[in-house]
Amino acid sequence: QFLKEGQLAAGTCEIVTLDRDSSQPRRTIARQTARCACRKGQIAGTTRNKPSCVDARIIKTKQWCDMLPCLEGEGCDLLINRSGWTCTQPGGRIKTTTVS
């Protein structure tokens, strides 16, 4: 089972674009676009801070932490109104991700 050039294996993703804006002090805003080849019942999401294919129910219910989006050892919390999630590092630093 050979993949054509540019073709992704089923269930995998790749980062297409990554834009960073560090103009604001102590704050970096990153916008990432990924390309995924998800199986039936899956949809593009984030697992361990990388693009991945996740159970579509997670996106529908906005239970973002069920994607396991944070790195090991980080705590995941939903934002108010489930517009995204935060990953809290053991040292207390918080990374916020909003879904658009």
Partner: antibody, heavy 120, light 107 residues
Framework: QVQLQESGPGLVKPSETLSLTCTVS????????WSWIRQPPGKGLEWIGY???????NYNPSLKSRVTISVDTSKNQFSLNLKSVTAVDTAVYYC??????????????WGQGTTVTVSS | DIQMTQSPSSLSASVGDRITISCRAS??????LNWYQQTPGKAPRLLIY???TLQSGVPSRFSGGGSGTDFSLTITSLQPEDFATYYC?????????FGQGTKLDIK
């Protein structure tokens, strides 16, 4: 180092409910998926289901009408309830951690297993 | 459901031998395949995930390969502790299904 420990009665009467608990130590239950697997005497492994940090679940359709998996994050525990048991539910029951290695979900930490016999 | 079929069901070999166990999926699962080892009275142990990636702490004499529907687990230079039952498991769909197992014993 994460360790899992199953607990619950070793003998359950037919038609009753089998209840097991898996206690997770050495790590947070909120950072992974968790699973139950069983193995009847002398046979192979059967996947029972998953639970996600939020409490959402995925079950084996062959058991779906009888099984409930729940999580208690405050106690770092997740549980299995299997109702209306019969002799065919006699098995060693394992709990396991499900690790997303990139795109590949695998059960990388297992409890030692607990034997449940269904008999009157 | 995806069916996983292992062959052979049992296998006899000697210390130092090289052996290969096969696993076939009833439909394509890309490389979403895991291998486990189980010794009597013990819980299964993850050996390989993603068809070919060795789990941390697993000796390099174990290797996995394949994609789509056909997979293999190879052990080079068998050691006494390798005599056990081996299971493949797909992680591409619900329900997760295991192969029926391959029992490896000493010739």
């Amino acid at each position: 180092q994460v360790q899992l420990q199953e607990s619950g009665p070793g003998l359950v009467k037919p038609s009753e409910t089998l209840s097991l608990t898996c206690t997770v130590s050495g790590g947070s239950i909120s950072s992974y998926y968790w699973s139950w697997i069983r193995q009847p005497p002398g046979k192979g492994l059967e996947w029972i289901g998953y639970i996600y940090p939020s409490g959402s679940t995925n079950y084996n359709p062959s058991l779906k009408s009888r099984v409930t998996i729940s999580v208690d994050t405050s106690k770092n525990q997740f549980s299995l309830n299997l109702k209306s048991v019969t002799a065919v539910d006699t098995a060693v029951y394992y709990c396991a951690r499900v690790n997303p290695f990139g795109y590949y979900y695998a059960m990388d930490v297992w409890g030692q297993g607990t034997t449940v016999t269904v008999s009157s | 459901d995806i069916q996983m079929t292992q062959s052979p069901s049992s296998l006899s070999a000697s210390v130092g031998d090289r052996i290969t166990i096969s696993c076939r999926a009833s439909q394509s699962i890309s490389t979403s395949l895991n291998w486990y080892q189980q010794t009597p009275g013990k819980a299964p142990r993850l050996l390989i995930y993603g068809a070919s990636t060795l789990q941390s702490g697993v000796p390099s004499r174990f290797s996995g390969g394949g994609s789509g529907t056909d997979f293999s687990l190879t052990i080079t230079s068998l050691q006494p502790e390798d005599f056990a039952t081996y299971y493949c498991q797909e992680s591409a769909s619900i329900p997760r299904t295991f192969g029926q197992g391959t029992k490896l014993d000493i010739k």
